[in-house]
Interface confidence: medium
Amino acid sequence: IWELKKDVYVVELDWYPDAPGEMVVLTCDTPEEDGITWTLDQSSEVLGSGKTLTIQVKEFGDAGQYTCHKGGEVLSHSLLLLHKKEDGIWSTDILKDQKEPKNKTFLRCEAKNYSGRFTCWWLTTISTDLTFSVKSSRGSSDPQGVTCGAATLSAERVRGDNKEYEYSVECQEDSACPAAEESLPIEVMVDAVHKLKYENYTSSFFIRDIIKPDPPKNLQLKPLKNSRQVEVSWEYPDTWSTPHSYFSLTFCVQVQGKSKREKKDRVFTDKTSATVICRKNASISVRAQDRYYSSSWSEWASVPCS
Amino acid sequence: RAVPGGSSPAWTQCQQLSQKLCTLAWSAHPLVGHMDLREEGDEETTNDVPHIQCGDGCDPQGLRDNSQFCLQRIHQGLIFYEKLLGSDIFTGEPSLLPDSPVGQLHASLLGLSQLLQPEGHHWETQQIPSLSPSQPWQRLLLRFKILRSLQAFVAVAARVFAHGAATLSP
């Protein structure tokens, strides 16, 4: 058993049929010694008396808010949550496996630049009685500070018969060094509580590996005289790290016909312009990627050829 | 050329070669990309690699003030990785012939380090990997980890030379 926060405790249980459970001793936070009784949740049934209460925690029915009273007055509370371990593996019932980039990916994180700011998100099908708490650091043995905000519900989607809820959190490294080569990964830890079930999820990454630039901005076409060719130009996204002579991007320019089956013409360039042939009803798209490190491509920025 | 006395390197040449290094480091990665990382473990070999850290002067402002600190750090890293790529870890099977990306990477690391420090000039305190032989089962995993680490190192080096070529070239 360990303390998650004041008056909230997590009991770690091996979860299998007829498991013996864990013996837990609760102590009433009071100077009083006599006349103390214990109840669980809203029930008025007295579970025991005395300053301490010893219970055998085996299942969710044994978890909940234990309250000690004296003469009708509440003295203190202890909320017990359960953390299940099945076949040596901690349960992951609350969050959905996003399966990208690999199986057992519950948290996904992205950064728009090297400033030390990043966003993580996760999915669940649970709509109520759900709380999240996020902590982060750079490195684990001698952790350096990363400050995370509160997790918020950022999207709701319908997936077949189920509703899916997306939560996200923004974090900022306290003393970021954008130009340095990271040697210690960022660690992100999410505590999830659904009713009386506790679970924790972690992710470990380098900012460089989660970089995904915003799409190029101000995408424009300039027809070239007496030619089917056009000059496409664009600019670095505002959110990208500066100076651009140091934090350089590379670009992919694509000409795509109306039909998905039509052959796509692609050009790769380090410049912020390119000359392409604009076909009728086609569109021109440009996306960006860090020039020197193969992290994710941005989403496409597009304009119609006409 | 970045000689220890403090004259400027051939920024444009260094930029071109460091960008090639980035490409090679990523094309070498698939050679070990199928790695099963379950046998993970923090081997000393990859813990000791020199990193370009915050105080090494490799940021745009540091380069403007005095690029020598940063260039020395890059040179140390290039020599370190060049030695690693010639070590037991990268020798032999799966075949790493000179025309493989790892072979070219090895040669390019040497080329860039020589551009930065021609024969006869010496920067002190070079960190050289002291390698105890890797166990055979560790070899593919170590290749994977070293190449991942090298990709990060050469990315920073390439940014330095690109910025130098754009803003510090005579």
């Epitope: - | 030695k83 010639g86 070590s87 037991d88 020798t91 032999g92 099977e93 790493l96 012939l97 000179p98 072979g103 390698l131 032989p133 166990q135 055979p136 089962w137 070899r139």
Partner: antibody, heavy 115, light 107 residues
Framework: EVQLQQSGPELVKPGASVKMSCKAS????????MNWVKQKPGQGLEWIGY????????NYNEKFKGKATLTSDKSSTTAYMELSSLTSEDSAVYYC????????WGQGTTLTVSS | DIVMTQSPATLSVTPGDRVSLSCRAS??????LYWYQQKSHESPRLLIK???QSISGIPSRFSGSGSGSDFTLSINSVEPEDVGMYYC?????????FGGGTKLEIK
């Protein structure tokens, strides 16, 4: 194809030393390790160690430390093994073997230690 | 050191037979196992690497299987020229160690 040409048979007296050679052709000498393996008459195989010709790094079987010394010469693409303080126990065929996978074997050098 | 044990010590077969040679490691060596053939008065030659990967130039009748600590070399239709000693080798950890060998002979 890799070919390994080993030096000829040796007859030496107990207590002496011997240095045998293995010339490699058809491969990039410095890109592969060279192993040495011992086989006593009518018996099995024992791995002695290897040398990495790129940086002269060596790795020995504990059993052969102090007995075998592995060296190489890049310019002639030749690996060498020196055996010291010879006894009759050292009488055997010694093979040089290319690569981690022991994929190409020399024809063997027969060493006879006898007074 | 990892001890490699081969069985049987000798195998007498008739041409055309399918035979299996066994090799056991004293601890798990994953798939880092090699098989060699040594004919009389010749150097050994590599038959199989990584427990089951075939080697170019080696007849397809030779195949390997197994992982962890139990391995098998199979010859699916023995030819008279297959006589000789067969050795397995631990390629997982140094020092490399070899099995004592299985002698394959024709009845």
């Amino acid at each position: 194809e890799v070919q390994l040409q080993q030096s000829g048979p040796e007859l030496v007296k107990p207590g002496a030393s011997v240095k045998m050679s293995c010339k490699a052709s058809g491969n990039t000498f410095t890109r592969y390790v060279m192993n040495w393996v011992k086989q006593k008459p009518g018996q099995g195989l024992e791995w002695i160690g290897y040398i990495n010709p790129y940086n002269d790094g060596t790795n020995y079987n504990e059993k052969f430390k102090g007995k075998a010394t592995l060296t190489s010469d890049k310019s002639s693409t030749t690996a060498y093994m020196e055996l010291s303080s010879l006894t009759s126990e050292d009488s055997a065929v010694y093979y040089c073997v290319h690569n981690w996978d022991l994929d190409y074997w020399g024809q063997g050098t027969t060493l006879t230690v006898s007074s | 050191d990892i001890v490699m044990t081969q069985s049987p010590a000798t195998l007498s077969v008739t041409p055309g037979d399918r035979v299996s040679l066994s090799c056991r490691a004293s601890q798990s060596i994953s798939h880092y196992l090699y098989w060699y053939q040594q004919k009389s008065h010749e150097s050994p030659r590599l038959l199989i690497k990584y427990a089951s990967q075939s080697i170019s130039g080696i007849p397809s009748r030779f195949s390997g299987s197994g992982s962890g600590s139990d391995f098998t070399l199979s010859i699916n239709s023995v030819e008279p020229e297959d006589v000789g000693m067969y050795y397995c080798q631990n390629g997982h950890s140094f020092p490399y160690t070899f099995g004592g060998g299985t002698k394959l002979e024709i009845k």
